[in-house]
Interface confidence: medium
């Protein structure tokens, strides 16, 4: 009724001293490798010469911190960020930061990034959209309350308001250019 070699699970590492033989009822706890987090029970039990339980380690890391317009990242850059790691932003002059200066990797997802707004209320260039363009020549600075319009490329349909407006140093939500369904 004893159990022999420990079972192996992806990205899971057994804790404690390894033995050749485990007695019935004995439990072994696993921990997850870096970037991974235990999902459910973390141990296996020896019952009737077989191990029961299946520790599962899931990847909770993040990649590519969110891009923030008119800001740059001041923390060290990594190819992969463990859950709980924070990334700090700084606004380019003369922009002012609103929101949390840091984003955090939270179980595989980044928390919401800050915004960098012009304290005078002016806006930078309108945000680019996939498969569409603004109808006027883009400027580097736009006065408060000014607006621009988007148009979609051929065969794409515009969803949302084609006109966006500069308010409090931020552009309103731009439209999307969607590919029409082909029947």
């Amino acid at each position: 009724t004893d159990c022999l070699s420990l079972p192996s699970f992806e990205n899971a590492i057994p804790m404690g001293e390894k033995k050749d033989v485990y007695k019935a009822g004995e439990q072994v706890t696993y921990t997850c490798a870096t970037y991974y987090k235990m999902d459910g029970a973390s141990n296996v039990t020896c019952i009737n010469s077989r191990w029961t339980g299946r520790p599962t380690c899931r990847d909770t890391s993040c990649v590519n911190p969110p891009t923030v317009q008119n800001a740059y990242i001041v923390s060290r850059q990594m190819s992969k960020y463990p859950s709980g790691e924070r990334v700090r932003y700084q606004c380019r002059s003369p922009y002012e930061m609103f929101g949390d200066e840091e984003v955090m990797c939270l179980n595989g997802n980044w928390t919401e990034p800050p915004q960098c707004k012009d304290s005078t209320g002016k806006c930078g260039p309108p945000p680019p959209i996939d498969n569409g363009d603004i109808t006027s020549f883009p400027l580097s600075v736009y006065a408060p309350a000014s607006s621009v319009e988007y148009q979609c490329q051929n065969l794409y349909q515009l969803e949302g308001n084609k006109r966006i407006t500069c308010r409090n140093g931020q552009w309103s939500e731009p439209p999307k250019c969607l590919h029409p369904c082909v029947i």
Partner: antibody
Framework: QVQLQESGPGLVKPSQTLSLTCTVS????????VYWIRQHPGKGLEWIGV???????EFNPSLKSRVTISKDTSKNQVSLKLSSVTAADTAVYYC???????????WGQGTSVTVSS | DIQLTQSPSSLSASVGDRVTITCKAS?????LHWYQQKPGKAPKPLIY???NLASGVPSRFSGSGSGTDFTLTISSLQPEDFATYYC??????????FGAGTKLELK
């Protein structure tokens, strides 16, 4: 460990300015934003405003004209000022630390403020 | 502005029950947070960003949802779980708002 503690007068006269201080320890105000939230007797929670780690502030639109939030990083203090108070401003006032995604992870124990002549 | 509607506003349940509290947003949101508050105490975070358990919160609490509909579930109610629960949202384009609360009472 992380702690926040609100302090200020428990009684304020109508039309006066309510002034509260949130003293923090266990973290730096240069790294975390701090919110002010209030709760009217027997009611739900109402966001007042926030001072971000960079020093910028944002307010509940319904209170914006009366609210000032500032911080003194060297003293580890965040202050709230609410002008022209009325009985409707009677509440328990809390400060809380920003966690990320505009959530709060640590809260002060709250300070009760009554507006009455 | 986005409004959060919690239901039910109050709920009677027994120890061991499975309890579900819902929070409905007036328009689609990305994240929702949940807090627990006991009388005379400050709120305590339970769940961040829809489904992430806050530090020290027992695994009987879970959160789910997306878009406009979110739920907080307590799989097996314990005596210390009787409290008021609030959902909360904030985005860069909307003020921070709380739901009106759900009071969980002993049946």
């Amino acid at each position: 460990q992380v702690q926040l503690q609100e302090s200020g007068p428990g009684l304020v006269k109508p039309s006066q300015t309510l002034s509260l201080t949130c003293t923090v320890s266990g973290f730096s105000l240069t790294n975390y934003g701090v919110y002010w939230i209030r709760q009217h007797p027997g009611k739900g929670l109402e966001w007042i405003g926030v001072v971000w780690s960079g020093g910028t502030t944002e307010f509940n639109p319904s209170l914006k004209s009366r609210v000032t939030i500032s911080k003194d990083t060297s003293k580890n203090q965040v202050s709230l000022k609410l002008s022209s108070v009325t009985a409707a401003d009677t509440a328990v006032y809390y400060c809380a630390r920003n966690f990320g995604n505009y959530a709060m992870d640590y809260w002060g124990q709250g300070t009760s403020v009554t507006v009455s002549s | 502005d986005i409004q959060l509607t919690q239901s039910p506003s109050s709920l009677s349940a027994s120890v061991g029950d499975r309890v579900t509290i819902t929070c409905k947003a007036s328009s689609s949101v990305t994240y929702l947070h949940w807090y627990q508050q006991k009388p005379g105490k400050a709120p305590k975070p339970l769940i961040y960003a829809t489904s992430n358990l806050a530090s020290g919160v027992p695994s009987r609490f879970s959160g789910s949802g997306s878009g406009t509909d979110f739920t907080l579930t307590i799989s097996s109610l314990q005596p210390e779980d009787f409290a008021t629960y609030y959902c909360q949202h904030r985005s860069s384009s909307n003020p921070l708002t709380f739901g009106a609360g759900t009071k969980l009472e002993l049946k």
